[in-house]
């Protein structure tokens, strides 16, 4: 190999050992029979050398540094050449370094031809191995602007006072052009400006200077985004830290097209703007840090550019001004992440503050819009609390548990609407009366409606789930002892059409001791399946539940249990089941932890089934499933 560097070229070539490998045989640079491990070639020198091994790329790297001095004379602006040409260099991993020094008042601009650059974070690498490391200078201090790969959006980087650009090319890479040019600009009066150009939909992740270390104190850095006017951009902060400021405040500023309040100033912890049309700028401003405990300012953010949806121009009014103790959250439904670019899906408040989730609270009217390619990616969860504090005022008072029409008119699917029903302890209980009788969801007879009511205790220490209930069954009402949550959960978009079937009334009633009472009025046509609360986990310790089962005069009810033994093993106490005829008060008592369950029995009159649990041993819980079937009486037994 022969490398000849022209005089005054300000180029230095250095060939040195790379990262040591576990190769058995060492390799040397051979110059006139001398074996060396490092070779430095300066401007005006010509050196001929060879390597002592077949694959020097496994041992050596080459660095070509060109110092460009813009302080003492004119700057060689324009397209930057790879000198010496890659064809003249040995096939080693090579790094071309351009170190440009300029006056503080001079702005320098690196312009990248297509493909543009994509910034990578710590620990990331470029697929093709080609990396661009760019740093600037503040007085004598080097500041890392970032490390970049090809195929991105970064088209220009402006700095002042100097720039150092390192282009790393793997030994096998055929690239023979630098891919960038240098131009001079007037002073930019900040650390740097990074321009990011979007041709179409896409995303870019960018980082503050020195990331993940701290951004230089009291500095300003700007990102200019070029976005086609027909697209929309949204900013989200992926990671940030704030330093301890002594003077001034760390902030981000946006210049947004069409905004009357430019610059718009945001704290880093604020929701960042979305749904921005066309070009915009984002600047990060540091502060004067506390000398004793400076902390670090750092920021990693993402800009997502996508087509506006039809919905993004539509404003939806959600009027919660007459609601109390209610919150509505629109959020992404859980999905498996795919590796390809997925357009963002945002919900915007007043068209500007866009984020992937949004919570609206009662007491106000809210205007929202959507910036989303597919609204099925979002769903709504609503929580409303109905509480009674004064038992004298609440007793017999009723509330309708219905999803407000404003919510049903939103173009996003309702997932859960939860009512938290709170009563004064040991003073009042609750009764739920559905507009349409309910069916309890069981494995034997699952619900196939577009929605269900999930009824569970709302007492934090109590793990009690009464079950899932849907319209079209035999349960006429559910009475519960204390605080519960009733959640209307939808399972299909057809809920919008079936919304009229929803409707549950809750009333506050005098306190009773049983955990729950189900009133069941079976239809002659079908078998009613009923199961104890907390199925799969077992009825909680010392809990009692009852079923009040009506039998019409001309019918006989067959009560059937689906296993021979309850399976419960009591640690303390005994578990009982009492079946009581309501007319005669005659009762059958079964010790569930000791005896077999009853064989199918026939009841000519309405009857109670009461189940009271003991304190079971773990793993031996009380779970019972039973059915009631009506058949016509053949003989008058009255």
């Amino acid at each position: 190999f022969e490398i000849a560097l022209p005089r005054e070229s300000n180029i230095t070539v250095l060939i040195k050992l790379g990262t040591p490998t576990l190769l058995a045989k060492p390799c040397y640079i051979v110059i006139s029979k001398r074996h060396i491990t490092m070779l430095s070639i300066k401007s005006g020198e010509r050196i001929v050398f060879t390597f002592s091994c077949q694959s020097p790329e496994n041992h050596f790297v080459i660095e070509i540094q060109k110092n460009i001095d813009c302080m003492s004379g004119p700057c060689p602006f324009g397209e930057v050449q790879l000198q010496p040409s890659t064809s003249l260099l040995p096939t080693l991993n090579r790094t071309f370094i351009w170190d440009v020094k300029a006056h503080k008042s001079i702005g320098l601009e690196l312009q990248f031809s297509i493909p543009r650059l994509r910034q990578i974070g710590p620990g990331e690498s470029c697929p093709d191995g080609v990396t661009h490391s760019i740093s600037g200078r503040i007085d004598a201090t080097v500041v890392r602007i970032g490390t970049f790969c090809s195929n991105g959006t970064v088209s220009r980087i402006k700095m002042q006072e100097g720039v150092k650009m390192a282009l790393h090319l793997p030994w096998f890479h055929p690239r023979n052009v630098s891919g960038f040019s240098i131009a001079n600009r007037s002073s930019i009066k900040r650390l740097c400006i990074i321009e990011s150009v979007f041709e179409g939909e896409g995303s870019a992740t960018l980082m503050s200077a020195n990331y993940p270390e701290g951004f230089p104190e009291d500095e300003l850095m700007t990102w200019q985004f070029v976005v086609p006017a027909h697209l929309r951009a949204s900013v989200s902060f992926l990671n940030f830290n704030l330093s301890n400021c002594e003077r001034k405040e760390e902030r981000v500023e946006y210049y947004i097209p069409g905004s009357t309040t430019n610059p718009e100033v945001f704290k880093l912890e604020d929701k960042q703007p979305g749904n921005m049309a066309g070009n915009f700028n984002l600047s990060l401003q540091g502060c004067d840090q506390d000398a004793q405990s400076p902390g670090i300012l750092r920021l990693q953010f993402q800009v997502l550019v996508q087509h506006p949806q039809n919905e993004s121009n539509k404003i939806y009014v959600v009027d919660l001004s007459n609601e109390r103790a209610m919150s509505l959250t629109i959020e992404p439904r859980p999905v498996k992440q795919s590796r390809k670019f997925v357009p963002g899906c945002f919900v915007c408040l007043e068209s500007r503050t866009c984020s992937s989730n949004l919570t609206l609270t009662s007491g106000s009217k809210h205007k929202i819009s959507f910036l989303c390619d597919d609204l099925t990616r979002l769903w709504m969860n609503v929580e409303k609390t109905i509480s009674c504090t004064d038992h004298r005022y609440c007793q017999r008072k009723s509330y309708s548990l219905q999803v407000p029409s404003d919510i049903l008119h939103l173009p996003v699917e309702l997932h859960d609407f939860s009512w938290k029903l709170l009563v004064p302890k040991d003073r009042l209980s609750l009764v739920l009366v559905p507009a349409q009788k309910l069916q309890q969801h069981t494995h034997e007879k699952p619900c196939n409606t577009s929605f269900s009511y999930l009824v569970a205790s709302a007492i934090p220490s109590q793990d009690l789930y009464f079950g899932s209930f849907c319209p079209g069954g035999s349960i006429k009402q559910i009475q519960v002892k204390q605080n519960i949550s009733v959640t209307l959960r939808t399972f299909a978009p057809s809920f919008q059409q079936e919304a009229s079937r929803q409707g549950l009334t809750v009333s506050f009633i005098p306190y009773f001791k049983e955990e729950g009472v189900f009133t069941v009025t079976p239809d002659t046509k079908s078998k009613v399946y009923l199961r104890t609360p907390n199925w799969d986990r077992g009825l909680p310790s010392l809990t009692s539940v009852s079923w009040n089962i009506s039998v019409p005069r001309d019918q006989v009810a067959c009560l059937t249990f689906f296993k021979e033994r309850s399976g419960v093993v009591c640690q303390t106490g005994r578990a009982f089941m009492i079946i009581q005829e309501q007319r005669t008060r005659a009762e059958e008592i079964f010790s569930l932890d000791e005896d077999v369950l009853p064989k199918p029995s026939f009841h000519h009159h309405s009857f109670w089934v009461n189940i009271s649990n003991c304190s079971p041993t773990s793993g031996k819980q009380l779970d019972l499933l039973f059915s009631v079937t009506l058949t016509p009486r053949t003989v008058d037994l009255t």
């Epitope: 009692s544 303390t572 106490g573 005659a586 008592i589 000791e594 005896d595």
Partner: antibody
Framework: EVQLLESGGGLVQPGGSLRLSCAAS????????MSWVRQAPGKGLEWVSA????????YYADSVKGRFTISRDNSKNTLYLQMNSLRAEDTAVYYC?????????????????WGQGASVTVSS | EIVMTQSPATLSVSPGERATLSCRAS??????LAWYQQKPGQAPRLLIY???TRATGIPARFSGSGSGTEFTLTFSSLQSEDFVVYYC?????????FGQGTRLEIK
Amino acid sequence: EVQLLESGGGLVQPGGSLRLSCAASGFTFSNYAMSWVRQAPGKGLEWVSAISGRGGSTYYADSVKGRFTISRDNSKNTLYLQMNSLRAEDTAVYYCAKDIVVVPAAKGYVMDAWGQGASVTVSS
Amino acid sequence: EIVMTQSPATLSVSPGERATLSCRASQSVSSNLAWYQQKPGQAPRLLIYGASTRATGIPARFSGSGSGTEFTLTFSSLQSEDFVVYYCQQYNNWPLTFGQGTRLEIK
């Protein structure tokens, strides 16, 4: 009114057998667990055995385990205690007692109604 | 097994007075304790269960208290028919066990 009437007591030689019966009335017999409790002359009460309402579970004091068997016939409203390999220390008045159903109830049994007792004497 | 110890073995009190009988368990029985009264030549009668709940038909002068290992049966004002034997019984664990009894006699 709950009534419990024991029968089958008497004098038996050590190693002999005896079967006590307890006829129940005034309540739904199958709903309630039943127990046998004995009282040796001049001594305190000692629980002997118990059986659940449908006969699915039985319990014994260590002193009688393997020798006594409790059973019930719900169709006849009758409780039994079959006593084999009797010993002198089994001499006592044997009471049958009805369990109280308290919900939630303790594991063991509380006896809210008692028979008048059947005397068993084991002597040679 | 759980050993139940009653004290005193005999208690002498005047009619109309207040009296307290004690029952101690060798290990905790929670509130699973009953008190019985036995008159000479008769079967026992349930007075209290659950440590403090009076059985049906039992006069209010009888009251029970305690939990864990220490229990008491209190008579607010002794009547002549109360001077008989009293037993405590634990039903927290098998086997069921009784105390040895306390005889209440007229002073």
